[in-house]
């Protein structure tokens, strides 16, 4: 805070604004009868330099001229760009305790002359907008710099506006506030920007343009779409535009898409027919406008119109599969399953499925509708049955898909050969096979079907399946495949009226089982021991069990146990062994083996055979 220079004055030579690299002389002079009261000769004038209100230097050593007690001149050099404050203070040397007293101060601004403004660009937004121009000012001047934008045109049209740049604001755009109208479409206009500050001035090159060069139409507004006869694929897009627009660009895409469909429309007059839309799909539409076919600029894109196209009747065919089981002496239960149509086939919200079961010879027909993707019925075991399913939305139904109900595993000659299942990674299994050797009818297709080897509801846990063309001999199954679970996989070969199948077990990842089987009983029959067990609970199997091992050794023996290895079959829960000595007490236990290794042993049972040794 500088007082109003009561004690003296500070002046700068050559000026308080200097170019970068120049030196300046600062003179500090006391007014008459000012100074240290008793001893004028003891007046000492000092000059302090401040940058951003922080004292950075005492210029005591930079004195170049001194009238003792009255005035001093200091030379300052190497001043940095921007503003530097200098404060002159009076130090009365005989009074050491009193701080120096401010006399006066001065600000020196260091900067550069403005460069010629470049890259002038002008726009008028819309037919009724005003002309605004922007430019590149070049290097920062660090001084207050005034810019003048001048426009001249036909019929002695002239117009100018001004703004300035300093350390608080930048001036590189001005709105002239005038409107160029379409009747001046062919006329040429010239703009120029002049920059001036205390160190110099410069002017841009003249920039010439026409009405079409600079007028950017307003983006179209009030966009809407009308679907012809509630069609899901054809619609008329409508919008409002400025009167002079001759060209539009339309872009549209389904909401989940990453690429736009682009259309150019000439003289559309706010209307365009689209014919390739996908039914029952959320779309986003945007429009841009241009005032001239060859020249001029495109408007910004309009705000998006988001809407869903209407439904159309489903297309495509359902992928049907079935399961059949005999449920009494003359009836069978048919469970039909089908996969949902994908959205491009469903073309709407599927309201229900129409299911038909028909006995071909007697013309018995069972019909029903369901909202589920499965349907179960009990029918006679006799006769040749066929099933069909179609999907319906609000606009209609798909063509029915037919499937003949055959005994899926009934024909041994149609059983595929050399079926194998290999773990590919954590969540898929590669199944391969060879065609049936002696099929008496042609294979129309293969079905690879898989189910987890753990208890499930027939209707709640439908099968998973893949249809494979007859010339393919492999399938990568991944749907609902989880690690550490064993799956039973069937490969069906289907002809027109027969089916054959082969089964294999497979897993995508395995570990050794958590525990071994639990021995529940040991019984002796005809000099053989029968070991009975309960299977390992499904969550503890951790993959496909390849075999069980039964171990035994004499009680208290330190010898290695003997063992018998049994191929795993879920239906088997007992096994005979016949190499134990009578009246010797043995300890028996079991383990289970997956491809990853052997489980810890299950429970131990002791047994002493009574019979004669084999």
């Amino acid at each position: 805070n500088i007082d109003v220079c009561k004690l003296g004055t500070v002046t700068v030579q050559p000026a308080p604004v200097i170019p970068l690299g120049s030196a300046a002389n600062i003179s500090c002079s006391l007014n008459p009868k000012q100074g240290c009261s008793h001893y004028p000769s003891s007046n000492e004038l000092i000059l302090l330099k401040f940058v951003n209100d922080v004292l950075v230097e005492n210029l005591h050593g930079k004195k170049v001229h001194d009238h003792t007690g009255h005035s001093s001149t200091f030379q300052v050099t190497n001043l940095s760009l921007g503003m530097t404050l200098f404060v002159c203070k009076l130090n009365c040397s005989n009074s050491q305790k009193k701080p120096p007293v401010p006399v006066c101060g001065v600000e020196i601004s260091v900067g550069v002359a403005p460069e010629p403004p470049q890259n002038i660009s002008c726009v008028q937004e819309g037919e009724n907008g005003t002309v605004a121009c922007s430019w590149n000012s070049g290097k920062v001047t660090y001084l207050k710099t005034n810019y003048t934008l001048q426009l001249s045109g036909p019929n002695n049209l002239t117009c100018q506006k001004q703004c300035f740049s300093d350390n608080r604001q930048n001036c590189n755009r001005l709105d002239l506030g005038i409107n160029l109208s379409p009747d001046l479409a062919e006329s040429r206009f010239i703009v120029r920007v002049t920059a001036i500050n205390d160190l110099g001035n410069s002017s841009s090159l003249p920039h010439t343009f026409t009405f079409l060069d600079i007028v950017i139409p307003l983006p179209p507004w009030d966009i809407r779409i009308n679907f012809l006869n509630a069609s899901g694929s054809r619609g008329t897009l409508q919008w409002e535009d400025e009167g002079q627009v001759v060209l539009n660009q339309l872009r549209y895409q389904p909401l989940n898409s990453t690429s736009w469909n682009m259309v150019n429309a000439t003289n559309a007059k706010g209307k365009y027919d689209l014919r390739d839309l996908r039914p029952f799909t959320e779309y986003e539409f945007q429009i841009s406008s241009k005032l001239h076919l060859s020249g001029g600029s495109w408007s910004n894109w309009s705000e998006s119109l988001r809407t869903r196209t209407p439904e159309e009747e489903p297309v495509g065919i359902l992928d049907i599969w079935y399961m059949k089981q005999d449920i009494d002496y003359d009836r069978q239960q048919i469970s039909l399953f089908w996969k949902s149509l994908n959205p491009s086939e469903a073309r709407g919200k599927i309201l229900h499925y129409q299911v038909t079961l028909q006995e071909v010879t007697k013309k018995t027909t069972l019909q029903n509708t369901t909202r589920h993707t499965s349907w179960t019925r009990v029918i006679p075991r006799t006769g040749a049955w066929t099933a069909s399913v179609s999907a319906a939305n609000s606009k209609g139904a798909s063509a029915p898909t037919h499937i003949n109900i055959v005994d899926l595993c009934g024909t041994g000659l149609l059983a595929p050969h050399q079926v194998s299942a290999k773990s590919e990674n954590m969540d898929n299994i590669l199944v391969t096979w060879q065609p049936p050797k002696k099929a008496d009818s042609a294979v129309r297709e293969y079905i690879v079907e898989w189910r987890a080897l753990q208890p499930g509801s027939i209707t709640k846990f439908p099968p998973h399946w893949l249809r494979i063309p007859p010339d393919n001999m492999s399938a990568l199954i991944s749907e609902n495949i989880k690690p550490y679970i064993c799956y039973e996989i069937r490969v069906h070969a289907l002809s027109e009226s027969q089916g054959g199948c082969s089964s294999i077990r497979g897993d995508s990842k395995h570990k050794a089982p958590v525990s071994g089987p639990h021995i529940t009983a040991i019984t002796e029959k005809k000099e053989r021991l029968f070991i009975s067990w309960t299977h390992i609970p499904f969550p503890e199997q951790r993959g496909c069990i390849l075999h069980y091992r039964i171990y035994w050794k004499e009680r208290d023996s330190t010898a290695q146990p003997e063992l018998c290895e049994i191929q795993y079959r879920r239906s088997q829960n007992s096994h005979p062994i016949s190499s134990l000595q009578p009246r010797v007490t043995y300890v028996l236990w079991m383990t289970a083996v997956t491809a990853a290794g052997e489980s810890p042993q299950g429970n131990e049972r002791e047994f002493c055979p009574q019979g004669k040794a084999n």
């Epitope: 027939i458 209707t459 846990f461 069937r490 879920r570």
Partner: nanobody, 119 residues
Framework: QVQLQESGGGSVQAGDSLRLSCTAS????????MYWYRQAPGKQREFVAY???????NYLDSVNGRFTISRDNAKNSVYLQMNSLKPEDTAVYYC?????????????WGQGTQVTVSS
């Protein structure tokens, strides 16, 4: 294992009604498809009705419209409401549950409850 227990059988006149109940216990987490069967003296056991996890039901033609199968999942129970009973409905009625493991169907049976319909 799954245990099934039927109740509600008895002797009635033709035209009367009975309600059979079947309660499941044990490892029933995967049992959703429940059936009623019957076996008349000197005949083979035959399917009567079933109900699926989604409450879809199906019936033997000769009982359709007279019998209704229903379930109460909270009580792990399935019921067979038998109306307009006929002498030919006389049989031992069995509750049955089926579950699938891989492609093998495991079946569980109750011990049966006698229904006698006299004219």
């Amino acid at each position: 294992q799954v245990q099934l227990q039927e109740s509600g059988g008895g002797s009635v006149q033709a035209g009367d009604s009975l309600r059979l109940s079947c309660t499941a216990s044990g490892s029933i987490f995967a049992i959703d498809d429940m059936y009623w069967y019957r076996q008349a003296p000197g005949k083979q056991r035959e399917f009567v009705a079933y109900i699926t996890a989604t409450n879809s039901a199906n019936y033997l033609d000769s009982v359709n419209g007279r019998f209704t199968i229903s379930r109460d999942n909270a009580k792990n129970s399935v019921y067979l409401q038998m109306n307009s009973l006929k002498p030919e409905d006389t049989a031992v009625y069995y509750c049955n549950a089926k579950q699938i493991v891989g492609f093998q169907i495991d079946e569980y049976w109750g011990q049966g409850t006698q229904v006698t319909v006299s004219s």
